[in-house]
Amino acid sequence: KKVVLGKKGDTVELTCNASQKKNTQFHWKNSNQIKILGIQGLFLTKGPSKLSDRADSRKSLWDQGCFSMIIKNLKIEDSDTYICEVENKKEEVELLVFGLTANSDTHLLEGQSLTLTLESPPGSSPSVKCRSPGGKNIQGGRTISVPQLERQDSGTWTCTVSQDQKTVEFKIDIVVLAFQKASSTVYKKEGEQVEFSFPLAFTLEKLTGSGELWWQAERASSSKSWITFDLKNKEVSVKRVTQDPKLQMGKKLPLHLTLPQALPQYAGSGNLTLALEAKTGKLHQEVNLVVMRATQFQENLTCEVWGPTSPKLTLSLKLENKGATVSKQAKAVWVLNPEAGMWQCLLSDSGQVLLESNIKVVPTW
């Protein structure tokens, strides 16, 4: 008995060939011996089965001895053994129809779980193997679960259902709703304008929701809201902004915030949360601000940084075109009685300069 696997909603062709390449009488029946379709004279006739409105045959191939039955818009309950009667012989074809669907919306927030459920005919024992766009392989039976979706899980998932050495492939498009980056750090000299950008890792025709930037300044004892906003069809409108600092927000996507001046009291880390309409949960992006200040006071030249810096970062004071350098894995360095000239304060990570500030030391007579 031949086994054919089909996909729910698809079309399948069950073949039946006569030994002689000529038009002859044939019938397709189900396992209950109910006629589905056949030939009477030169005409296709249909029986009383539930399939009658979805079953057809290729008339153009009859004179080649090919009497296939085509079933459109397959349903799980179409799974059955079908019998083709032609030239006094019977050919049996077992059709197994499977469906694979996501249990929820296919637009899911990062960190949420994805469950794929296999619909299968009674008595079947299929196995399912899914491959994510990032190459992750997951296996399961009737259900496949991905507990925590990541950005890289966005795209087309390819799932293969296997039964009796036969396979059928499903493709499911999953959109993981997330920001492009989980975290970003902006390095600025004191007084410079700061630009924060929060690009999304997905595109939606209509994007509506609301959000907030919640900030923990390094020097502050508690965190606070810097700005709240609404998003209507990709248009941004500010709801409430703190008095200090007075942030500005772009009216279009990507979400874009401008801090007029980088000041030590603003250095710290923030969390931008975005809630999307009809979704429970929020998208998050962490943003850090590191601020550098170089000052000369009396005989002391000091360079300081504020904000979240890793312990492996190096802070240096260096006299331009001279070898004089003081370096520390600390948040402040200083030189007593510095030589006159242009001094550079550098914040670097393994030799790569992240931030630099120049200060001119004038000779004292």
Epitope: E212, S225, T228, R240, D244
Partner: antibody, heavy 119, light 107 residues
Amino acid sequence: EVQVVESGGGLVQPGGSLRLSCAASGFTFSSYWMSWVRQAPGKGLEWVANIKEEGSEKYYVDSVKGRFTISRDNAKNSLYLQMNSLRAEDTAVYYCVREGGQWLALDYWGQGTLVTVSS
Amino acid sequence: DIQMTQSPSSVSGSVGDRVTITCRASQGISSWLAWYQQKPGKAPKLLIFGASSLQSGVPSRFSGSGSGTDFTLTISSLQPEDFATYYCQQANSFPWTFGQGTKVQIK
């Protein structure tokens, strides 16, 4: 520790006036919007008014507009509610609340002060 | 003004029960919704902000969901200290408005 403490409640005749005060501590008062919320005996919560950090914006529920005035003194870490032309339906426990929670939530509430308007 | 309608107005449950309270806004409020718990003679306490985020220090048995006009507060396993009145509140537009409250009582 964040604390908000209300005072000034009491018994007042209809048509009379009362001034409620709220003393805040444990946070930078001048950085937060503040609200007054009331609760009539055995009833639910009703937001009354709020005021921006530096006092430039004030909002009221319709039922108190023109009768109540919210104000603040950031130097004294204090919030006030001046209530004039009081009515029996203004009888309630009045809470001073910090609007400092994420997503504009009301995160710290005082213990409340009872205002009774009765002849 | 935006009307907030809570249901049911009261619910009886036993320790360990799952309790769900719904809140409906008369117009869309995105995720500008908070849930509060109030015990007799005490000030309200913030539980959930932004429709679904848990306030620091609040037990994880409390959860919030929804956006737009329909919101839900769920207590997954009722504890003795959870018997109280719960209020939803919108912060989408002035005046801020509260639901009428849902009293969770012992069965």
